[in-house]
């Protein structure tokens, strides 16, 4: 079953290479278990770059190799990538899966076109 | 640096499937990331897909998304490419890569440092 995901349309990532940005979706029933991934759709791919699934109420858990991090408030998700540099601006997508109790939802935003600038470097000092 | 071999390609009607495999030995599978590319008569080489250390993460070209799908076998060393409604463009050498790298944004970009002898998956129509 289809179900509505709400993200900003463009975040800016600071200085050090870090995005955040909110995923809210429109809970049709009580899920107790939620799986949310972040997509990035660019050059011509699309890549999962990270997932996590998380009871609600408590912590979100990340699969390996992730440079997410998150914590969730109700039907809302706070996500934060990191490390970001120039080549990463792209779309990425917040995906919502209501994985607990049955029926299973399926919720995909129209993605977070993410911008980053890396910093110049310091001029040297005399 | 790890040792891959690919097997599985052969030649295809138009709509046809295939399973190409790649066998790793020599270094901890796990901690690589694994990815295949392909490479057609006249072409560069071109990013078909990856698959992160546990297997939990994927991308994708768009060229192959909802048809080709990547997986792993760590125990056995494995990485799998499993092709479905092939079509002639998808003609080409396969190869499998290994990158001794965290997953990330970008894995088609990675430094892939080992790569297997590829194989040939030719589709007819």
């Known amino acids: 079953k289809a179900m509505h995901v709400a993200q900003p349309a463009v975040v800016l990532a600071s200085s050090r290479g870090i995005a955040s940005f909110v995923c809210e979706y429109a809970s049709p029933g009580k899920a107790t278990e939620v799986r949310v991934t972040v997509l990035r759709q660019a050059d011509s791919q699309v890549t999962e770059v990270c997932a996590a699934t998380y009871m609600m109420g408590n912590e979100l858990t990340f699969l390996d190799d992730s440079i997410c991090t998150g914590t969730s408030s109700g039907n809302q998700v706070n996500l934060t990538i990191q490390g970001l540099r120039a080549m990463d601006t792209g779309l990425y997508i917040c995906k919502v899966e209501l994985m607990y109790p049955p029926p299973y939802y399926l919720g995909i935003g129209n993605g977070t076109q993410i911008y980053v600038i890396d910093p110049e470097p310091c001029p040297d000092s005399d | 640096e790890v040792q891959l071999v690919e097997s599985g390609g052969g030649v295809v009607q138009t709509g046809g499937s295939l399973r190409l495999s790649c066998a790793a030995s020599g270094r901890t599978f796990s901690m690589y990331t694994m990815g295949w590319f392909r490479r057609a008569p006249g072409k560069d080489r071109e990013f078909v897909a990856a698959i992160s250390r546990s297997g939990g993460l994927k991308a994708y070209a768009d060229s192959v998304l909802g048809r080709f799908t990547i997986s792993r076998d760590n125990a056995n060393e494995m990485a799998y490419l499993q092709m479905n409604s092939l079509n002639p463009e998808d003609t080409a050498v396969y190869y499998c890569?290994?990158?001794?790298?965290?997953?990330?944004?970008?894995?088609?970009?990675?430094?892939?440092?080992?790569w297997g002898q590829g194989t040939q998956v030719t589709v007819s129509s």
């Open positions: 890569a290994a990158a001794p790298v965290p997953w990330g944004t970008r894995p088609s970009h990675f430094t892939y440092d080992s």
